[in-house]
């Protein structure tokens, strides 16, 4: 077969080929940020000629053109400056309202390198309607100026701009406009991952946050947890495998879907995942009718087995058939469960379509969506039961209109996106499911995105201050209790001056709480073994503080999961009959378990907890500490089995002021406290300039560094005695 010519350079840009110079290969141009390629792509035809998709005239030279943002077409009840036909990247537009009108939205907006305006649509509103003035986004024209109950407004975009969002919206009885805000965008524009992740995440969190299954009921026979079975989600992942998707991109589609699956299973809801790859025909790799669809490992392994070559005989893009296979799956499940049953009607459905282009065969995908809406009986009351996310990747042949038509339209949410490349998609899926936005006391959730603050990463972390100076750290284990070390409290029982500083989204300094009561382990006595030549002994170094008020859960304040509790069991996705021993076997399951603690400056530092025979050799070093233990004969007199041991190899050592802080591990995107910092043989902060300075121990140091942490699995009776009404403990 003839190959296509190689004189396809783009001045100022680069290109990639999906299948070399052979027929069927897609050539994709890219330009530096702030520029866009024209044309965006070319396809090598079987005749050995390049064809530009959608082009009517002969092949023109590819160039990088400057990105521009659309100008306002009309702005009601106010003025905007400067008045230009379109705006360059970095250019601003400012809005002011006439007297009697209040500006809602952004007074100044800047044109971003992706051809999208930052901020929100500016609206001059006098609050007269039943619904607020819906405004007119930049580049749009609106018809309809009455905002009473039942009134409709319609939107279209000027010139060659593409409308995403709702072209028609209705003022509903609750004072909210139906659908989603329309945005007019350049055909070449795309979304930045940092915008998509929160938008997608917000929408997803709405759906997931509605179904937290832990609910306590008090009964005369003690307490019992009820798992609400009503919260079930069917997630359908549709992965485009057509010719224009390169094998490498398909791998990233798969990886992104795996991330999504991993995250979704970390939520405490019941979920079934379907996986469908498609080109000319769909291939169902996992159906929600299969019991394995509820098992994360099974779902991920079916994703891993998805093969790019499965579709090599039919390389078109049949989005209709892919969506129709979702419809057929729903139909089968409805017949199985019974159309009128709660079991069927209470399932929420989310479809995520990952594609790189427009459908080019099989009919309109919109028809399949209509069938899906019909079978799920989606109306205003049941709008929450279906979410369709249409994500275009590659900004070349992606059809904005089609994506927009497929994506759900919900107030304040976006469901249709175009990303620049698969790398951006991966970033989005990494950050979209930020459970830390949930306001209930779901435990062990930290924001893991790159731009999160230290406190958002470890929102359970608190600082304890006796007076003005900070002295110890601790961890929120509920909305009112903090777990810390007993040795922090050596001033008798007067804790009236003490404060606990908890993370707060409104202040970088956090929020201070008084202590209602301090429960210090009665077994703790640092001088208990003084007559044996053990000058300091840290057995039972554990304390609980009850705060004077409840902490409001937020991105900056949230409890960590305590093992051996029902809350941790849900987070670990373990079966209901699990025991404390099962948790210990799952969390401390190796000779060397990677774990973390939080430094004085808030950053997360790494250690390795030594178990089994490695615990013994880790603890042995204590015999070399002659000041604290002048005539020690048995190391176990000092390092009892209450302690976890770290500090070997490249481990960080905690400073004294980090005592009481959580020693924690990450499992399934959730965090579990297995220990608390107690004592050690080396202080890396001693005499340092500030909280950011730590000194590594010299390699020759005798004894070498070792750190000991109270093992929470060994403190179960005490924890249960004091937290029995706060947490739901599993059998030992």
């Amino acid at each position: 077969a003839p190959s296509c010519p190689q004189n396809v350079n783009i001045s100022g840009g680069t290109f990639t080929l999906s299948h070399g110079w052979a027929p069927g290969s897609l050539l994709t141009y890219s330009c530096p940020q702030g520029l866009y390629p024209s044309p965006a792509s070319r396809l090598c035809k079987s005749s050995g000629q390049w064809q530009t998709p959608g082009a009517t005239r002969s092949l023109s030279k590819a160039v990088c053109k400057p990105v521009r943002c659309p100008a306002p077409v009309s702005f009601e009840n106010g003025i905007y400056t400067p008045r230009l036909g379109s705006y360059p990247v970095g250019g601003n537009v400012s809005f002011e309202c006439e007297d009697g009108f209040i500006l809602r939205g952004s007074p100044v907006r800047q044109c971003r390198p992706n051809g999208m305006w930052d901020g929100e649509t500016a609206v001059c509103d006098n609050g007269a309607g039943h619904c607020p003035n819906p405004g007119i986004s930049l580049g749009a024209v609106r018809t309809g100026f009455r905002f009473g109950h039942g009134d409709k407004v319609r939107y279209r975009c000027s010139s060659n701009l593409v409308l995403t969002g709702s072209s028609e919206r209705e003022c509903q009885g609750n004072g909210v406009w139906s659908g989603t805000e329309p945005i007019c965008r350049q055909p070449y524009s795309y979304d930045f991952p940092e915008d998509v992740a929160p938008a997608l995440g917000t929408s997803f969190s709405h759906m997931l946050g509605a179904t937290n299954p832990t609910q306590k009921t008090k009964e005369s026979l003690g307490r019992k947890i009820q798992i609400q079975r009503s919260g079930h989600l069917n997630l359908y992942l549709l992965l485009d495998c057509s010719q224009s998707v390169s094998e490498n991109d398909f791998l990233i589609f798969k990886e992104s879907a795996s991330l999504m699956v991993d995250r979704i299973f970390s939520f405490e809801i019941n979920v079934s995942v379907a996986i469908i790859t498609f080109a000319s025909e769909p291939k169902v790799l996992m159906s929600v009718l299969n019991d394995n669809s509820r098992d994360m490992t099974e779902v991920i392994s079916s994703l891993e087995n998805a093969n790019y070559k499965d579709h090599e005989n039919g390389t078109g893009t049949n989005t209709y058939a892919a969506l129709n296979s979702v419809y057929l799956m729903m139909n089968n499940q409805m017949r199985l469960l019974g159309m009128e049953t709660m079991a069927w009607q209470e399932i929420r459905h989310a479809i995520i379509l990952l594609t790189d282009g427009k459908s080019n065969m099989g009919g309109s995908p919109k028809t399949a969506v209509d069938h899906i809406r019909e079978i799920l009986n989606i109306n205003q009351k049941r709008n929450d039961y279906l979410d369709i996310y249409a994500i275009g990747v590659g900004k070349l042949d992606v059809d904005w209109r089609e994506l927009n038509e497929l994506g759900s339209k919900k107030d304040g949410e976006r469901h249709a996106f175009i990303l620049q490349d698969t790398k951006a998609l991966h970033q989005v899926f990494e950050h979209m499911l930020d459970v830390s936005k949930l306001t209930d006391t779901i435990c062990g959730v930290g924001n893991m995105s790159a731009n999160a603050s230290d406190q958002e990463r470890t929102p359970w972390h608190v600082t304890i201050k006796p007076k003005s100076q900070e002295t110890c750290r601790g961890a929120l284990i509920s909305d009112q209790w903090v777990l810390t070390a007993a040795h922090c409290f050596r001033d008798g029982n007067d804790h009236s001056l003490w404060r606990v500083n908890v993370g707060d989204p409104k202040s970088q300094w956090g929020k201070e709480f008084l202590i209602e009561k301090a429960v210090i382990s009665p077994g703790f006595d640092v001088f208990a073994k003084k007559n044996q030549g053990i000058l300091e002994f840290y057995g039972d170094d554990i304390a609980l503080l009850k705060l004077a008020q409840k902490v409001k859960m937020s991105t900056h304040a949230r409890p960590i999961c305590l093992p051996c509790t029902m809350e941790a069991n849900l987070a670990l996705r373990r079966p209901q009959g699990s025991t404390c021993r099962d948790h210990e076997n799952e969390l401390l399951n190796k000779q060397s378990v990677p774990a973390h603690f939080v430094a004085l400056n808030g950053s997360k530092l790494n250690i390795n907890l030594k178990m089994g025979v490695e615990w013994t050799s880790c603890a042995e070093v204590v015999s070399q500490e002659k000041t604290m233990f002048p005539n020690l004969t048995d190391v176990r007199e000092v390092v009892t089995d209450q302690f976890l041991c770290s500090g070997t190899q490249e481990d960080e050592s905690p400073c004294k002021g980090e005592s009481g802080g959580a020693v924690f591990l990450e499992r399934r995107f959730r965090f579990f406290q297995v220990g608390l910092v107690s004592w050690g043989l080396y202080n890396p902060c001693l005499g340092s300039a500030d909280k950011n300075s730590r000194k590594r121990a010299p390699r020759s140091k005798v004894p070498p560094p070792r750190d000991f942490h109270i093992n929470l699995f060994r403190m179960q009776p005490w924890l249960r005695q004091h937290l029995g009404d706060v947490l739901n403990f599993l059998p030992l």
Partner: nanobody, 122 residues
Framework: QVQLVESGGGLVQPGGSLRLSCSAS????????MGWFRQAPGKEREFVAS????????EYADSVKGRFTISRDNSKNTLYLQMNSLRAEDTAAYYC???????????????WGQGTLVTVSS
């Protein structure tokens, strides 16, 4: 907060000894880690030694290890620094410090004495 007053400084020949004392007011002395810092003319303040609130563990800067000994008497609310084999480079103002956490971060310390001068010279 603990009020601290150092004493015992003076002029001493190289190889000689001195004992510094630091007297603390306030009944909470026994719950504080205590430490000594020093500052030579034109230099930064540096850590010398510390002792835990129990008296059970001590830490020293490498430059003084084996020559200086820190101790405390909780019944007298007093901290000591026994300095032997003194060298010219030990010449500095010596400060006593109290710290509840035991890290003695210079940026956070709020209990300092006014210092006592030690001059090592022949």
């Amino acid at each position: 907060q603990v009020q601290l007053v150092e004493s015992g400084g003076g002029l001493v020949q190289p190889g000689g000894s001195l004992r510094l004392s630091c007297s603390a007011s306030g009944h909470t002395f026994r719950s504080y880690y205590m430490g000594w810092f020093r500052q030579a003319p034109g230099k930064e303040r540096e850590f010398v030694a510390s002792i835990s609130w129990t008296g059970g563990s001590t830490e020293y800067a490498d430059s003084v290890k084996g020559r200086f000994t820190i101790s405390r008497d909780n019944s007298k609310n007093t901290l000591y620094l026994q300095m032997n084999s003194l060298r010219a480079e030990d010449t500095a103002a010596y400060y006593c410090a109290a710290d509840y956490s035991g890290d003695f971060l210079l940026s956070d310390l709020d209990s300092w004495g006014q210092g006592t001068l030690v001059t090592v010279s022949s």
